[in-house]
Every structure is written in structure tokens, then in C-alpha cells.
């Protein structure tokens, strides 16, 4: 049996960013059993977590991580130094900044060590797995009468990322959402004076750096409006 | 800290062409992002054009199909050709470098302009 499995997962390019491999078997046997797919995320160029969902296997079993990096420097063969279990079973493994090459193809190799022909190996393309930290400090200034400025910081160059600011009133049942682009401020041109406003933010590693389609958490959400807006009129920032 | 060294501006007439270079006291290896920005007097700095490790690269729209954002890494040196100038192109640009998460360095400027 060899097989090879091309799957999506939500980060295609013009070449897959995805794919697995098993080795092939002279009879079948534990070794055909598929292993579970790794999914990756960088979180915010920190660190990494690489996870498998252990409990896909028909028994308990401690399979081993190995990664490298495709056509670089860094092509020779490293072991998972840092497992994530899983009810005392390996179901990770996490990689800090030193060992994340953002820009080179990352091979990641699942194993199972009892099986050492038992073994699937997947490429990524981990500047499509970036995930930011959530925006921070949003700040509101009033431009005028009937205009707010929202302001935010994130910790991360300001360039690679895009958000996305949603805010309501208190008396919208939905909320209305605004794409923004690397520069990280949003205009809201008419405010009624007599509502209290809520807005919120969260970013992604796209599209000048990378093309990442997971958005960070939302921010803390930041009020304005009926019953805070006379105690500043050109500055107010409450966090909920 | 990285040290980025601009050079190449000076005067063209506009359909001229220029070509920028920065200059990085690290190895390109070492870095993720770098990019070319501009200002023009009273503005804020804009970006331009920007090449990330695997030599993606993006192009602000009022310069795409004119100028092409490039890296040597043999010779440690980033690029910015620039063709069709045009009067409104006239600004200081400055090269920057972006290590993830937040690290960013910038260049002294290099002034370029463009009149007849």
C-alpha cells in the first residue's frame, strides 16, 4: 500500500501547503492505520504548537514529532524537545521563536515509534498559520461634533496586519463590521450623541506578509456614548 | 540593532528611471521583511513596496507595473527599481527592515525627484 493524500486545509496556494505521505507496507498490518493529521499555528511569531488529536489512535500511543525545513540551512533533522500531552499521551509538540523559520517550508513527521515504518509527513507553509495577539489599548478620540477616531496597538509590526472593527449601539441587535488595512485606525463620520456604542477588534497576519486566514481573538471591547461621553468630550476610553 | 544604509536617489525627469539600494548591516537571512516607504513634506510616511524571506512581494497601487522591490542575498542588498517616474513619486524613501514579531529598523532617507 502507498499512499499518497492530498488534503485542503483552508490555506491552499498555488501549490498545496498540505500534504501526507505513509510508507509503504508489504502487508496490512498497525502500519497502514492513517495517523492523525498535525495542525499548526504560530502564535504571534512566539512560539508554536503542533497537535494531533491522540485520541484517533486505536490504542493510547506516544507518537513521536520530527520536523526540518525544506531547501535551507536548516534541513537536518530535529526532535520535538517540548511534547503537549494529552491525558499523559503525547498530542503536540511546541516550538519556540528560535526554531520558527517563517519563510521556509516546514516539514513536520508524525511517528509511530512502536511502528517505525508507521510515519506520515506534511509540508506547510507556516506564514499561513500565523495567529496575532488580540489588538490592545483601543483608545477613542472625538474629531468633532459627530465624528469618533478608534485607535488600537498590537504587538506586532504594524505593516503585516489587517482587522476588522465591529461596533453596535445599544439598540442594534447585530453589529456592523468594517474592514481597516495596515494602518490601524478607524473612523466612525456620524455618532448619535444619545446611544452608547461598543466596538471591537481583531487582526490577521495578511496580506503584506503573509496569507494567513485565522484572525486573533477579538479585543476588549471599548464603550462610548449617552452616559460617559459628557465626562471627557475629546477622550474617553473604557474598557468593559 | 540593524543598520540600514539607503542610496541611489538624486533628480530624474519624469519617465526616468532610478534604482534604490539598502544596504543591511545583518544578513538578509536574519531577517523577515523589508520594505521601501516614503514621505513627502506635511505627510505621513507611506509604504511603498515590500519583499518577505521567501521573495513574495507586494506593491502599494499607485507603483504597480512601474516599480519592482528586489533582494540579492548574496550580496546582502535590497532593491527598488524604479521606472516611469512620475512628479507625484518626489518624496524621501527610506528602507526598513521587520524582524517578527516587532522588531523594525529604518534608514537614514535618500531623497528623490522628479521634475523637468
Known amino acids: 500500500l502507498n499512499t499518497t493524500i492530498l488534503t485542503p486545509n483552508g490555506n491552499e496556494d498555488t501549490t498545496a501547503d498540505f500534504f501526507l505521505t505513509t510508507m509503504p507496507t508489504d502487508s496490512l498490518s498497525v502500519s497502514t492505520l492513517p495517523l492523525p493529521e498535525v495542525q499548526c499555528f504560530v502564535f504571534n511569531v512566539e512560539y508554536m504548537n503542533c497537535t494531533w488529536n491522540s485520541s484517533s489512535e486505536p490504542q493510547p500511543t506516544n507518537l513521536t514529532l520530527h520536523y526540518w525545513y525544506k531547501n535551507s540551512d536548516n534541513d537536518k533533522v530535529q526532535k520535538c524537545s517540548h511534547y503537549l500531552f494529552s491525558e499523559e499521551i503525547t498530542s503536540g509538540c511546541q516550538l519556540q521563536k528560535k526554531e520558527i523559520h517563517l519563510y521556509q517550508t516546514f516539514v513536520v513527521q508524525l511517528q509511530d515509534p512502536r511502528e517505525p515504518r508507521r510515519q506520515a509527513t506534511q509540508m506547510l507553509k507556516l506564514q499561513n498559520l500565523v495567529i496575532p495577539w488580540a489588538p490592545e489599548n483601543l483608545t477613542l478620540h472625538k474629531l468633532s461634533e459627530s465624528q469618533l477616531e478608534l485607535n488600537w496597538n498590537n504587538r506586532f509590526l504594524n505593516h503585516c496586519l489587517e482587522h476588522l472593527v465591529q461596533y453596535r449601539t445599544d439598540w442594534d441587535h447585530s453589529w456592523t463590521e468594517q474592514s481597516v488595512d495596515y494602518r490601524h485606525k478607524f473612523s466612525l463620520p456620524s455618532v448619535d450623541g444619545q446611544k452608547r456604542y461598543t466596538f471591537r477588534v481583531r487582526s490577521r497576519f495578511n496580506p503584506l506578509c503573509g496569507s494567513a486566514q485565522h484572525w486573533s481573538e477579538w479585543s476588549h471591547p471599548i464603550h462610548w456614548g449617552s452616559n460617559t461621553s459628557k465626562e471627557n468630550p475629546f477622550l474617553f476610553a473604557l474598557e468593559a | 540593532e540593524v543598520q540600514l544604509v539607503e542610496s541611489g536617489g538624486g533628480w530624474v525627469q519624469p519617465g526616468g528611471s532610478l534604482r534604490l539600494s539598502c544596504s543591511p548591516s545583518?544578513?538578509?537571512?536574519?531577517?523577515?521583511?523589508m520594505g521601501w516607504y516614503r514621505q513627502t513634506p506635511g505627510k505621513e510616511r507611506e509604504w511603498v513596496a515590500t519583499i518577505t524571506g521567501d521573495d513574495t512581494t507586494h506593491y502599494e497601487n499607485s507603483v504597480k507595473g512601474r516599480f519592482t522591490i528586489s533582494r540579492d542575498t548574496a550580496k546582502n542588498m535590497v532593491y527598488l527599481q524604479m521606472n516611469s517616474l512620475e512628479p507625484e513619486d518626489t518624496a524621501v524613501y527610506y528602507c526598513?527592515?521587520?524582524?517578527?514579531?516587532?522588531?523594525?529598523?529604518w534608514g537614514q532617507g535618500t531623497l528623490v525627484t522628479v521634475s523637468s
Open positions: 526598513n527592515a521587520g524582524i517578527l514579531p516587532r522588531e523594525e529598523y
Open positions: 545583518e544578513r538578509l537571512s536574519s531577517i523577515d521583511i
